[in-house]
């Protein structure tokens, strides 16, 4: 019996679902009544999920795991882990026992993208050349620990007088605060780059300091230019900041978040206090940061339906607003491949290869190619169906006439995440059955 798992770690984003792939080669005449399948944590041997006595024995791991029951008979022992947490990171062992037995371990690497950094200055008023300022770059809710780089407007690295701290919250996600102390020149740009080493994702922000300041009193509302990309099920921060006047107090502040198109109220702050969420109780402000001009909104457990533009309106004596776009995304699962017919295949037969990938958003781009990487465009039909949550299941069907042998690959691309999920099937010339028998 051969048990196969991917060599590379499975990288899963916090809050999303991950598939830990595991397959075995069933013998002819194999029935599920013969199968024992055990998933366990490699290090502690804690039971995660099991299949025995012809039935799924369920999750022993926080009720967040599932098998693919319809695929077990074909040798697919993969485990679906839902709503991935940082604490899930590590090695999982897939143990298969029929008459023969075998096991293999697959590594789960958990990741969470860092938010676009917010930059603050101290002091932030009446700055003059020669003043020493502290620039703080803060990026939130990432994993694993970030690498932080500072540079000036010419791209020259700034390494002196930098202090970086990273604190994990209860979920194990890191908030990064990096402090740069500089002496101001006539003017200057300072950039902070926060890198997620696993995702190879860079989040950067910069601040340009022109020492002579504009007149006080005018409110400036700032939001990120780029859409905020949030994964379904995770929390998103819609950044919004304003420049409080000297002597500003929260009693003077009106802050309103609303949907840009419908003007539906989302969250508000007035009369010196947070008036709470008017949006499914999934929003929150950062009350401790409001007095410093941070009007950002936290949107919890992001759904596809949340996608769109949110307006941040700030009114003190002066007033202003700005809109920030939320782009929702969900990674597509590794495609599963099926053949029809799947028995006694011979050169010259016409087969239908179906590539299925699940629970992604937005709609995927699907590409087929042969073993030489040549695109296959003829006789391809792709359908995408959204479920109640708005996530898409993709089914792409390729009809081909078998040659002596051939490899057919299907690539499912998430255009927002630039995430590619691929599956392939190799069909050999001799009469065969799919999946191959032991």
């Amino acid at each position: 019996l051969e048990v196969q798992v991917p060599e590379d770690p499975v990288v899963a984003l916090v809050g999303t679902d991950a598939t830990l792939c595991c397959s075995f080669s069933p013998e002819p005449g194999f029935s599920l009544a013969q199968l024992n399948l055990i998933w366990q944590l490699t290090d502690t041997k804690q039971l995660v999920h099991s299949f025995a006595e012809g039935q799924d024995q369920g999750s022993a791991y926080a009720n967040r795991t599932a098998l693919f029951p319809d695929l077990l008979a074909q040798g697919n022992a993969s485990l679906r882990l839902q709503r991935v947490r940082v604490a899930d990171e590590g090695s999982f062992t897939c143990f298969v026992s029929i008459r023969d037995f075998g096991s293999a371990a697959v590594s789960l690497q958990v990741a969470a993208p860092y938010s676009k950094p917010s930059m603050t200055l101290e002091p932030n008023k009446d700055l003059r050349p020669g003043d020493t300022v502290t620039i703080t770059c803060s990026s939130y809710q990432g994993y694993p620990e970030a690498e932080v780089f500072w540079q000036d407007g010419q791209g020259v690295p700034l390494t002196g007088n930098v202090t970086t701290s990273q604190m994990a919250n209860e979920q194990g996600l890191f908030d990064v605060h990096s402090i740069l102390r500089v002496v101001l020149g006539a003017n200057g740009t300072y950039s902070c780059l926060v890198r997620n080493p696993v995702l190879q994702q860079d989040a950067h922000s910069s601040v340009t300091i022109t020492p002579q300041r504009s007149p006080t009193g005018a409110v400036e509302v700032q939001v990120p230019e780029d859409p905020v990309v949030a994964l379904v099920g995770t929390d998103a921060t819609l950044r919004c900041s304003f420049s409080p006047e000297p002597g500003f107090s929260l009693a003077q502040l009106n802050l309103i978040w609303q949907l840009t198109d419908t003007k539906q109220l989302v969250h508000s702050f007035t009369e010196g206090r947070d008036q709470g969420s008017a949006y499914a109780n999934r929003t929150a402000l950062f009350p401790d940061l409001l007095a410093q001009g941070n009007a950002s909104l936290r949107l919890q457990r992001v759904r596809v339906a949340d996608e769109g533009s949110f307006t941040c309106f700030v009114s003190i004596r002066d007033f202003g607003s700005a809109a920030v776009s939320l782009q929702v995304a969900a990674p597509y699962s590794k495609p599963s491949m099926t053949l029809e017919p799947n028995k006694d295949l011979r050169p010259g037969d016409t087969v239908t290869i179906t590539c299925s990938s699940y629970r992604g958003y937005p709609e995927a781009e699907v590409f087929w190619q042969d073993g030489q990487g040549v695109p296959l465009t003829g006789n391809v039909t792709t359908s995408q169906m959204a479920n109640e949550q708005g996530l898409f299941d993709v089914h792409s069907v390729l009809r081909v006439v078998l040659g002596a042998n051939g490899t057919y690959s299907c690539l499912v691309r998430n255009p927002v995440l630039q995430q590619d999920a691929h599956g392939s099937v190799t069909i050999t010339g001799q009469p065969m059955t799919f999946p191959p028998e032991a």
């Epitope: 504009s214 009193g217 005018a218 509302v221 003077q252 009106n254 309103i256 009369e271 002066d318 607003s321």
Partner: antibody, heavy 117, light 108 residues
Amino acid sequence: EVQLVESGGGLVKPGGSLRLSCAASGFTFSSYGMSWVRQAPGKGLEWVAAISGGGNYTYYLDSVKGRFTISRDNAKNSLYLQMNSLRAEDTAVYYCARQGLRVMDNWGQGTSVTVSS
Amino acid sequence: DIQMTQSPSSLSASVGDRVTITCRASENIYSNLAWYQQKPGKAPKLLVYAATNLADGVPSRFSGSGSGTQYSLTISSLQSEDFATYYCQHFWGIPPWTFGGGTKLEIK
């Protein structure tokens, strides 16, 4: 003492244009948002447009959006309302008002706009 | 957009009377409401801001009250100079910052 003085009103034909001005004095102009409010003959007050202190945020009544433009020149302590494609229903006295803490705490004396053929 | 419904639209009263004008907002405006007085041919004058605060120089016979969607302006003892038209206006959220339809207070 805060003073707001409107000018630029007059008689104009439908489809025509006018530019209203409001000269401000007695306060730090760039620190305050400003609004235009109008009042048709024998009718109530109607908020028309607002502009933030720095001039970077503007808001309009739906019925004037695309026809009217509010702007300001902080160096000249002046507020403007450019009115294009004027209609009979735009006939009104137009007031400029200073925005205090979510209130219009000072008003000009108004300038009259008549749109008629 | 938020609608402001002011009532009554007109009111006859005598010097010394106590009168109350009300304003209803179509949604919670969290006390972001002002009251103005306007006399014929003149610009409006601020009376009350933030629902309950009297503007500088406004006599104490004027008072504002209310919260949520319901607000009122009360004149405790009418004086001859109080006969005018009164308007409420909300300042909640992104404009338009609409006015109520006005209440004309006339001498009985």
